[in-house]
Structures are given as structure tokens and as C-alpha cells.
Interface confidence: medium
């Protein structure tokens, strides 16, 4: 998209990783058919994509989860794409919500988030979910990425 | 996105086509408000988008389907975005799953898949679903495309 | 994506706005973490994104809604991405459908639409839904945007 040394392509696509951590922030890995164009975008601590260059980015995430209405809280399953910029609080960029299924033992559903946002140098984006234990980590089900316009 | 003769824009958006074939691979057509930027991306056999140039591509698919829990298998409806590169096995890039609805005669649901992937010259991408007979082919409901970064 | 004066970046991301209007066309605002790259794309009347330059655009929308099967019509909730080009009728580019939830008082669900389309100078895109009163306007839930390739 950006050609030559001045404008190298900047893009990433990382794959979900099951985690024993109790945090609501999803974990990712450079595994399988992942993309990491160069060091102008990096996966930090397995949880956030951090960019070195300011600019407009299309950022996306897909989360597949399996839940059951009776076994879950009344609140829906929510996936949030969040931004942490240097010198600023975290903020929500995008959210999607799906009510839990009545299927047993659980019903699978997929959420897709995506949008164009201005990122500052050093900005990080990450994905939060209401219940990480419900996330599906089978091949291709849950992923996260970005591309610089 | 890529300007000049060296870097022509490469993009495609194709429209779902009902098929009598029993294959799980969805069929597509250059009809309606479709996009086919040039011959650097082609729709082959109505089933796969094939690219001539190596590079990073944002690939996406949207599938709307109508299913009923009682009339369907217990397994969810799954849509898969798959890659076939020359000299390599097929592989799954992305998947999404939705449990069948209890609505009668069937309940409509939509799935969206999208991600950034490196494609080799001659690579093809296609979309698989668990039950093609459940796919909705009304205007705009089911489509497939890509753009080269 | 497009560098230099000849090819400025063109991108927009706007945020849903609750409206007292009875129209099925969703309302948007330049608020929160919105994007409006320059005057080559504008938000008109709070309802449509209008572009000044011809070209290929990736256009997307995300709609989160809360509905209940008993309280809603039998027809599913449908979100449509529509195009109005100068001198042409409106046309549907993309649609997604989700059957209403049985959750009470209502069950949240999210829809994502996205695709690559050729737009003419002065073309406008907008989002229609079957029942705007069911749309969720909390931070990040419902948004609309585009980027020029």
C-alpha cells in the first residue's frame, strides 16, 4: 500500500491463543498463517498490536465464542476493540454484542469488528471480551489485524 | 491503492450464485454491482478468486444463511475462507460459526470474515460452507472479495 | 494509501447518532473517535458519506441492535448498505440479516457489512435498517465508514 522505503506496507494478522490468564484481554500469537509485514508493527506481550508510524489504519478483529444462556451471565457476550495511545487513557474504538445461545452445551457465534482510525506513533490496539473462556481457538475462528492505508 | 503501471489497483467483489452442485464450495458471479479491477485478479470456475501478483491482500467474505435448529444437524453453520497456493495443500485462513436459529421455518443470520494475508502468484481463495442449500442469495446478502494493499 | 497531492488518503469513520426521525436511514455524526481525512469525503445531512473522486472504495458498516422475537415483526432485522449515484436510482450494495432473539427484554446482536465498490464523483452511500429504534448507540456499537484504495 505504501511502496518504497518511504512508504513500506504495514500490516499484521495474528491468531488467537488460549490463555490461562484471567484477564479480559485476548492473547494472540504469530503462528499459523499469520502476517507481520515488518517491524513498523509489532505484537507486544502477546496482547496488543503496536504501530511505530502515525497514520490511518483499518483495524479489525474476529471473535468466535461458544456460550449458553443458562450457564452465562444475563449480559451479552461483548467484544471490544480498544486503543491505548501514549499519554491517553484506553478508549473503546468498536464493540459488538451477541446474546448467548440457548443451544446446549453451548452455541457458537462469530463477531466481526472493523474500522478506520488514526493512530499515533506508539499507539497500541487490543481486544477485550466479557468472558475469554468462551472464545473458540480452532483454526481461523478468532483473529486480529490491521493495515495502514 | 497501487498507482501507475507498476502498481495497478487490484480488487474484486463478486456476488453469490445459487448452484445445483452438491459441493460445499460457494459459487460466485460477476453480476449486479460487482468489481473486477483488471486481469490481475480473476474469478475461476465461478468458485475462486485467483491472483497473479504476490503480495498482501485484505480478503473478505460475507455469507447470509437461513437455518432451523430442528431441521439442521447439531453442528453449527460454519463458513470458511480457504487458500489454495500452487504446490501446496489447501488451508483454512478464516472461519466463523453460528448456531442454527429456533425460528421457523428458518432464521436468517449473517457471517462476515476478513483478514490480511500474503498471497503467492497463482494463489486462489474460496469460501466453504457446511450447507450451501441454506445460503441466502438475495441482493447483497452473500458476497466475496479482496483488495491488494 | 494515496500519497502526495495527486493521491491524498481518503477515508471516513462516523459514529451512530440516535434520531427521532422515523426514517429507516441511520443517522451518523463526526463525534467520539471519528475519522474524516479531508473534504474529498463528507458526511451529508448526518446520513450519507459522499465522495468527490471516482475510484474503488472499501465501504463498511457495523450495526448493533437489540430486539425480541415476540415484540418484533416476524421478518428478521436487516441492515442494508445502499448507494446513490448522480443520475441513477438507489441500489443495495450489501445486506445482512439476523433473526430476532428470544432473550428478554431484548437480545443484542451485531452485524458487519463490508465490500469493495466503484464509486463515481458525487456518489453517496448510506445505511438502512428495518427498525432504527432497535439500534444500539453505546460507544463503538454502531459505525460506518470507507477508505479509498
Amino acid at each position: 500500500m505504501q511502496k518504497g522505503d518511504q512508504n513500506p506496507q504495514i500490516a499484521a494478522h495474528v491468531i488467537s491463543e488460549a490463555s490461562s490468564k484471567t484477564t479480559s484481554v485476548l492473547q494472540w500469537a504469530e503462528k499459523g498463517y499469520y502476517t507481520m509485514s515488518n517491524n513498523l508493527v509489532t505484537l507486544e506481550n502477546g496482547k496488543q498490536l503496536t504501530v511505530k508510524r502515525q497514520g490511518l489504519y483499518y483495524i479489525y478483529a474476529q471473535v468466535t465464542f461458544c456460550s449458553n444462556r443458562e450457564a452465562s451471565s444475563q449480559a451479552p457476550f461483548i467484544a471490544s476493540l480498544c486503543l491505548k495511545s501514549p499519554g491517553r487513557f484506553e478508549r473503546i474504538l468498536l464493540r459488538a454484542a451477541n446474546t448467548h445461545s440457548s443451544a446446549k452445551p453451548c452455541g457458537q457465534q462469530s463477531i466481526h469488528l472493523g474500522g478506520v482510525f488514526e493512530l499515533q506513533p506508539g499507539a497500541s490496539v487490543f481486544v477485550n471480551v466479557t468472558d475469554p473462556s468462551q472464545v473458540s481457538h480452532g483454526t481461523g475462528f478468532t483473529s486480529f489485524g490491521l493495515l495502514k492505508l | 491503492m497501487q498507482k501507475g503501471d507498476q502498481n495497478p489497483q487490484i480488487a474484486a467483489h463478486v456476488i453469490s450464485e445459487a448452484s445445483s452442485k452438491t459441493t460445499s464450495v460457494l459459487q460466485w458471479a460477476e453480476k449486479g454491482y460487482y468489481t473486477m479491477s483488471n486481469n490481475l485478479v480473476t474469478l475461476e470456475n465461478g468458485k475462486q478468486l485467483t491472483v497473479k501478483r504476490q503480495g498482501l491482500y485484505y480478503i473478505y467474505a460475507q455469507v447470509t444463511f437461513c437455518s432451523n435448529r430442528e431441521a439442521s444437524s447439531q453442528a453449527p453453520f460454519i463458513a470458511s475462507l480457504c487458500l489454495k497456493s500452487p504446490g501446496r495443500f489447501e488451508r483454512i485462513l478464516l472461519r466463523a460459526a453460528n448456531t442454527h436459529s429456533s425460528a421457523k421455518p428458518c432464521g436468517q443470520q449473517s457471517i462476515h470474515l476478513g483478514g490480511v494475508f500474503e498471497l503467492q502468484p497463482g494463489a486462489s481463495v474460496f469460501v466453504n460452507v457446511t450447507d450451501p442449500s441454506q445460503v441466502s442469495h438475495g441482493t447483497g446478502f452473500t458476497s466475496f472479495g479482496l483488495l491488494k494493499l | 494509501m494515496q500519497k502526495g497531492d495527486q493521491n491524498p488518503q481518503i477515508a471516513a469513520h462516523v459514529i451512530s447518532e440516535a434520531s427521532s426521525k422515523t426514517t429507516s436511514v441511520l443517522q451518523w455524526a463526526e463525534k467520539g473517535y471519528y475519522t474524516m481525512s479531508n473534504n474529498l469525503v463528507t458526511l451529508e445531512n448526518g446520513k450519507q458519506l459522499t465522495v468527490k473522486r471516482q475510484g474503488l472504495y472499501y465501504i463498511y458498516a457495523q450495526v448493533t441492535f437489540c430486539s425480541n422475537r415476540e415484540a418484533s415483526s416476524q421478518a428478521p432485522f436487516i441492515a442494508s448498505l445502499c448507494l446513490k449515484s448522480p443520475g441513477r436510482f438507489e441500489r443495495i450494495l450489501l445486506r445482512a440479516a439476523n433473526t430476532h432473539s428470544s432473550a428478554k427484554p431484548c437480545g443484542q446482536q451485531s452485524i458487519h457489512l463490508g465490500g469493495v465498490f466503484e464509486l463515481q464523483p458525487g456518489a453517496s452511500v448510506f445505511v438502512n435498517v428495518t427498525d432504527p429504534s432497535q439500534v444500539s448507540h453505546g460507544t463503538g456499537f454502531t459505525s460506518f465508514g470507507l477508505l479509498k484504495l
Epitope: T23, F89 | - | Y33
Partner: antibody, heavy 120, light 107 residues
């Protein structure tokens, strides 16, 4: 209706500690970042600290860094401010404030405040 | 830290007057400027955010403008309930900082 109710203020000696609480109701507490802002008698507003909705990220003004700790218990819909090594200049009315939906760095609802007096 | 400077520090006005308060940031803060109203013994109340967006429930006689470093709060026709202290706040970067306040008194 959004309500924020601070408690825990009082008179404390320099070097002492105090724990402020803010009970929240009328909104989904865990979805919002929360702030503490203070106002010395007859003076203006000073931001003290903030915490993300999940509680995983915290932020402090330089004047309180290392002495104050912000935390939250989302199961109890309660925000806390643990204040240690208190100084005379910490004397103020302490407000808890909810972060705005569209920009977490501004505040749309405030409690009525609790007075902290640091004096010997 | 970004310093926020309000002027005037206080002003006297009558009901029906048009009142303007200015706020200057020590560096550009884009449109990340917010205004609060505080009455004696009460908590602050958000009036305007993102430079010009009226908070829900705030009367339309309040308006905000500006960008970069210079911002203005205008009350088009002062009402009795508007006599209060007004604070600007930048939400551009941590630490969040407020102006010193402008007290609007009855003439």
C-alpha cells in the same frame, strides 16, 4: 439515574492514610473508566487519578504518584482511592467522576464529594 | 503538562447579556476541550465536550468554539441559573488539566 456517592473522608494527620470509596449505581459500572478529581478549599479543580473499566490500567497525576492507589471492585460497583503519606496540600474535597462514553478523558457525572483534611 | 489559562478570572453580567469566556492551551490540543459549570457547594457539571458538542440536557444558549490552542465558551443570553464558576479542561493528554476557573457574578 446515574449516581455516585463518595465516602471515607475526614481529618487525618500528615503522614497518615485514608481510603476513599465511591459507590456507583444507575449504569453498568464495569464499562466505564472512573476518575478522582479534587478541589482544595476556594481553589480550582485538579485531576488526581483514573482507572479503566476493567481495572487493568491506572493513571496518576505526578503530585500523587507513589502515594495514592486507585482501584475498583466491579462486582460491588465501587471505586476506591487509597491515600498514603498524606500532606497538608492534599486537603481538598475529593470527587469521583465517571468517564464520558465518547472520550474517557472527560467526565460526565460527578459525585457530591467527600472532604479530606490533612492537619496536625 | 499542558497549562490551561482562562480569562477573565471573573466577570459581572446581567440577565440577558451575552457572555464569552476564553480558554488558552499551552500547546495544541486539537478539539479535545471541555467545559464544566460549578455552583457553590455543588459538584461540577459537564456542559460541552469536544470543543462544541453540547452534553445531553444542556440548554442551547451554551455554545463552544475554537480549535488548536484557543477556545471560547459563549452564553448567548445569560439566565439567573447560569451564575456559577466555569472551568475548561483538556482531554488531549495525561495529566488531565483544568483552567483556573471563571466566576460569573450578577452585576
Amino acid at each position: 439515574e446515574v449516581q455516585l456517592l463518595e465516602s471515607g473522608g475526614g481529618l487525618v494527620q500528615p503522614g497518615g492514610s485514608l481510603r476513599l470509596s465511591c459507590a456507583a449505581s444507575g449504569f453498568t459500572f464495569s464499562k466505564y473508566a472512573m476518575n478522582w478529581v479534587r478541589q482544595a478549599p476556594g481553589k480550582g479543580l485538579e485531576w488526581v487519578s483514573a482507572i479503566s473499566g476493567s481495572g487493568e490500567s491506572t493513571y496518576y497525576a505526578d503530585s500523587v504518584k507513589g502515594r495514592f492507589t486507585i482501584s475498583r471492585d466491579n462486582s460491588k460497583n465501587t471505586l476506591y482511592l487509597q491515600m498514603n503519606s498524606l500532606r497538608a496540600e492534599d486537603t481538598a474535597v475529593y470527587y469521583c467522576a465517571r468517564a464520558h462514553d465518547y472520550d474517557s478523558m472527560l467526565m460526565d457525572y460527578w459525585g457530591q464529594g467527600t472532604l479530606v483534611t490533612v492537619s496536625s | 503538562d499542558i497549562q490551561m489559562t482562562q480569562s477573565p478570572s471573573s466577570l459581572s453580567a446581567s440577565v440577558g447579556d451575552r457572555v464569552t469566556i476564553t480558554c488558552r492551551a499551552s500547546q495544541s490540543i486539537s478539539r479535545y476541550l471541555n467545559w464544566y459549570q460549578q455552583k457553590p457547594g455543588k459538584a461540577p457539571k459537564l456542559l460541552i465536550y469536544a470543543e462544541s458538542t453540547l452534553q445531553s440536557g444542556v440548554p442551547s444558549r451554551f455554545s463552544g468554539s475554537g480549535s488548536g490552542t484557543d477556545f471560547t465558551l459563549t452564553i448567548s443570553s445569560l439566565q439567573p441559573e447560569d451564575f456559577a464558576t466555569y472551568y475548561c479542561q483538556q482531554s488531549y493528554t495525561i495529566p488531565l488539566t483544568f483552567g483556573q476557573g471563571t466566576k460569573v457574578e450578577i452585576k
